[in-house]
């Protein structure tokens, strides 16, 4: 069964950047991926990237960057213009679709011992649903 | 696995209505764009409607501005389309959609380019 991971990082450089990294595993090459994100509730979402293997990318604020890393994975990073941190109890979701073989989703959200001023991220545990 | 079930189409005289519903599942339904696209017999796909993720903006192709209303329950995870003043020129195979087309400017349209798609319900519109 495909799957869809989902990792979302602090920079340990600048407290107000963070990046999500989203990966596809399972067989069929990619077609489009969406990156949206929204509350803990799952409610009020809206789109952060959408990612197209030959027409490109075209992301929303306060999306900075997304790119493709591999023919299967991405990463997106944002940028958090705030005091404070907003993300933190942020909501990511990634969508891969693989036509015409169907589409899968994932989410994720900063752990919440996330602590720049400790040492490299953790080993990314990815966060997996196949439903 | 996400699935988009569509149902509501049929068969229908010119000038009646029908409502199509999408049920959507294994993603979060709130957090995405929608859109209904459809294909005539024997045409390519065309662009009908899109609605954001919160339900507040929508689109239409013109020639369904007026007659066609797209909305959204993401309480009930399902997308609608109310489709009033049927035509004959709407006879077609709808199918819902996650994506907005307008992303990348796309002027010849597949389901490939969207991230999500349905099987498609026939609606006819004929006397």
């Known amino acids: 069964t495909p799957e869809v991971w989902v990792q979302v990082q602090m920079e340990a450089t600048e407290l107000s950047s963070f990046t999500v990294h989203c990966g596809f595993l399972g067989p069929g090459s990619i077609s489009l991926v969406t990156v949206s994100w929204g509350g803990p509730d799952g409610a009020g979402g809206t789109k952060l990237a959408v990612l197209h293997p030959e027409l490109g990318t075209r992301q929303w604020a306060p999306a900075r960057q997304a790119r493709w890393e591999t023919q299967s994975s991405i990463s997106l990073a944002l940028e958090d213009s705030g005091a404070s941190s907003p993300f933190a109890n942020t909501t990511f979701c990634c969508k891969f679709a693989s036509f015409p073989e169907g589409s899968w989703e994932s989410c994720g959200s900063l752990p919440p011992s996330s602590d720049p001023g400790l040492s490299a991220p953790p080993t990314p545990v990815p966060i997996l649903r196949a439903d | 696995e996400v699935q988009l079930v569509e149902s509501g189409g049929g068969l229908v005289q010119p000038g009646g209505s029908l409502r199509l519903s999408c049920a959507a599942s294994?993603?979060?339904?709130?957090?995405?764009?929608m859109s209904w696209v459809r294909q005539a017999p024997g045409k390519g796909l065309e662009w009908v409607s899109t609605i954001n993720s919160n339900a507040g903006r929508t689109s239409y192709v013109d020639s369904v501005k007026g007659r066609f209303t797209i909305s959204r329950d993401n309480t009930k995870n399902t997308l609608y389309l109310q489709m009033n003043s049927l035509r004959a020129e709407d006879t077609a195979v709808y199918y819902c959609?996650?994506?907005?087309?307008?992303?990348?400017?796309?002027?010849?349209?597949?389901?490939?380019?969207?991230?999500?798609w349905g099987q498609g319900t026939m609606v006819t519109v004929s006397s």
């Open positions: 959609v996650e994506g907005d087309p307008h992303n990348f400017g796309l002027e010849s349209l597949s389901l490939r380019d969207f991230g999500s």
């Open positions: 294994g993603f979060t339904f709130s957090y995405y764009d």
